[in-house]
Interface confidence: low
């Protein structure tokens, strides 16, 4: 139904707390350099205005669209051009072009310092002093670093953060209570960020149809007892929610997500037997819980997929009659039978099935032509299964850090032109797949591994788009989203690359490395490893291991030395010489 005042409608639906949080996220995602105080001031102004519209929907400007209202606020910021350069040109445009312009200027890799967590005592003091401001800072800092973070889900993580602080700040040993819990939230939030970015990429590059196909596959796996009409309805609603969030329409997105959660809980009988626990929770927890609910038990009497999609004499007629519905039902039927496959794999199979029908239905004897299609799926299924086995075996042998290093070597050889910080970030993220997925039961490994890798590689593609340097990466990133991971996996050593000359300063370290946290130490060592591979792209695993072991020994020795500086300055050059010799 149409509302006289959109802003009043959303304020009433969402309530003041969520309304303010979402507006803060929206502004922080659009203008990523502004301080918290600048954004907090705008949020308060927007909220005060919304309240006047709630009181009187006919008041001045209350009938304006949210894009108009928010865009006008952003464009009124002083020194916009000085701080944001050409983004200020967006303000010369009219809606909807102005909002599109803002979206295009979102920066996936803003030059902001890492989000440092204050020490426990200081955190608890500022949290107790003003919990609202404290959580506002959290929303602002995460949103500006992750401009496509799923806004209602960020509110959920802020709520988690709040609960952890409330609990731990009351304890004697705040540090040991906070650290593991906040690390857990951070890890989950970072995974949520790359997953959502992948969804927005799908929407931006390939449109709603592509996202809806992803949703049909995912929902069919989770709710195998829901019929096709139900899955289609849920996929349509989920597509709308994600389109809104990816498009910066965060109030509408959060409101529609709440509606979808309400619908699912009211229609559990037709969707899944596993929803009740989620439905008993309050809104943010409920929606989060539903998004990762366990798969329902598969119906026991599902007929073989071949009956309707291969053996039926009417396949081509049915396909021609309504292509999208026919392919949608194929994807639904295949996905509900295969919770053990990744969504990416299911979409590749559906694509293969579509291509087969396109080819075969134009031939003289279609059934003879498409009769072998299910057998032709086999290599497509085997490839990711082998990938999972090989990589999980390697992870179990090397542990997370060693596994990250193996991936770093592999990817530096595939794309040595990519900047070392990007390669290190990608390898560290890709390497976490081991800890995240390889410990799961066998039937959950493949979907976990492949869908996670796809999301991480999407980030690699986004960063590479800004400054394209590798033809290998460009080739893999230009194709469809579901083909990216197999494309990257198939890449070999880039033979066109001219090795980097050896620079001693790249491998020169100082005593300050000794006091760094373990994670930072690892990053320093991995940076050196990537540089070694760029210098010698065809170095063997043994050569690289020799050098890295020597390097680790050098750090250990010098960091334990009485005079660390002298040790680094005298032993460092010897290490460099040994490295050069080992790689000669």
């Amino acid at each position: 139904e149409a509302h006289k005042s959109e802003i009043a409608h959303r304020y009433n639906d969402l309530g003041e707390q969520h309304f303010k949080g979402l507006v803060l996220i929206a502004f922080s995602q659009y203008l990523q350099k502004c301080s918290y105080d600048e954004h907090a001031k705008l949020v308060q102004e927007v909220t005060d205005f919304a309240k006047t519209c709630v009181a009187d929907e006919s008041a001045a400007n209350c009938d304006k669209s949210l894009h108009t209202l928010f865009g006008d606020k952003l464009c009124a910021i002083p020194n916009l051009r000085e701080n944001y350069g050409e983004l200020a040109d967006c303000c010369t445009k009219q809606e909807p072009e102005r909002n599109e312009c803002f979206l295009q200027h979102k920066d996936d890799n803003p030059s902001l310092p890492p989000f440092e967590r204050p020490e426990a005592e200081a955190m608890c003091t500022s949290f107790k002093e003003n919990p609202t401001t404290f959580m506002g800072h959290y929303l602002h800092e995460v949103a500006r670093r992750h401009p496509y973070f799923y806004a209602p889900e960020l509110l959920y993580y802020a709520e988690q953060y709040n609960e952890i602080l409330t609990q731990c700040c009351a304890e004697a040993d705040k540090e040991s209570c906070l650290t593991p819990k906040l690390d857990g939230v951070k890890e989950k939030a970072l995974v949520s960020s790359v997953r959502q970015r992948m969804k927005c990429s799908s929407m931006q590059k390939f449109g709603e149809r592509a996202f809806k196909a992803w949703a049909v596959a995912r929902l069919s796996q989770t709710f195998p007892n829901a019929d096709f009409a139900e899955i289609t309805k849920l996929a349509t609603d989920l597509t709308k929610v994600n389109k809104e969030c990816c498009h910066g329409d965060l109030l509408e997105c959060a409101d529609d997500r709440a509606e979808l959660a309400k619908y699912m809980c009211e229609n559990q009988a037709t969707i899944s037997s596993k929803l009740q626990t989620c439905c008993d929770k309050p809104l943010l927890k409920k929606a989060h819980c539903l998004s990762e609910v366990e798969h329902d038990t598969m119906p026991a009497d599902l007929p073989a997929i071949a009956a309707d999609f291969v053996e039926d004499q009417e396949v081509c007629k049915n396909y021609a009659e309504a292509k999208d519905v026919f392919l949608g039902t194929f994807l639904y039927e295949y996905s509900r039978r295969h919770p053990d496959y990744s969504v990416s794999l299911l979409l590749r199979l559906a694509k293969k099935y579509e291509a087969t029908l396109e080819k075969c239905c134009a031939e003289a004897n279609p059934p003879a032509c498409y009769g072998t299609v299910l057998a032709e799926f086999q290599p497509l299924v085997e490839e990711p299964k082998n990938l999972v086995k090989t990589n999980c075996d390697l992870y179990e042998k090397l542990g997370e850090y060693g596994f990250q290093n193996a991936i770093l070597v592999r990817y530096t050889q595939k794309a040595p032109q990519v900047s070392t910080p990007t390669l290190v970030e990608a390898a560290r993220n890709l390497g976490r797949v081991g800890t995240k997925c390889c410990t799961l039961p066998e039937d959950q490994r493949l979907p976990c591994v492949e869908d996670y890798l796809s999301a991480i590689l999407n980030r690699v593609c986004l960063l590479h788009e800004k400054t394209p340097v590798s033809e290998h990466v460009t080739k893999c990133c230009s194709g469809s989203l579901v083909e990216r991971r197999p494309c990257f996996s198939a890449l070999t050593v880039d033979e066109t690359y001219v090795p980097k000359e050896f620079k001693a300063e790249t491998f020169t370290f100082h005593s300050d490395i000794c006091t760094l946290p373990e994670k930072e130490k690892q990053i320093k060592k991995q940076t050196a490893l990537a540089e070694l591979v760029k210098h010698k792209p065809k170095a063997t695993a043994e050569q690289l291991k020799t050098v890295m072991d020597d390097f680790a020994q050098f750090l250990d020795t010098c960091c334990k030395a009485a005079d660390k500086d002298t040790c680094f300055s005298t032993e460092g050059p010897n290490l460099v010489t040994r490295c050069k010799d080992a790689l000669a």
Epitope: P224, N225, A226, D227, F228, A229, E230, A269, T270, I271, P299, D301, L302, P303, A307, D308, F309, D312, E314, V315, K317, N318, Y319, E321, A322, V325, F326, T329, Y332, E333
Partner: nanobody, 115 residues
Framework: EVQLVESGGGLVQPGGSLRLSCAAS????????MSWVRQAPGKGPEWVSA????????RYAESVKGRFTISRDNAKKTLYLQMNNLKPEDTAMYYC????????GSQGTQVTVSS
Amino acid sequence: EVQLVESGGGLVQPGGSLRLSCAASGFTFGSFGMSWVRQAPGKGPEWVSAIDSGGADTRYAESVKGRFTISRDNAKKTLYLQMNNLKPEDTAMYYCTIGRSTSRGSQGTQVTVSS
């Protein structure tokens, strides 16, 4: 848009008969197996019967075997359920569904068996 519209329900005495119909539109009816599902007041949905896309393979729940017959007319895009020797425990809302699931995505038709 996928639509399933059931009809033919009503009030009948024990031992009586009814024939339910389900008119399908918005998808290629002849490509899909179909089912009948029912839901009694205060109970979860219960799968009743299923038929494959061509109409050759039919399945029934133990509770209705020998009394109910499922059939389809692909030309008319219609699914049927012939119910004979009805019992009070057959009282429920009846739904047709795509595939072989216990979910319902339509309005259903009420069947009441009572003396």
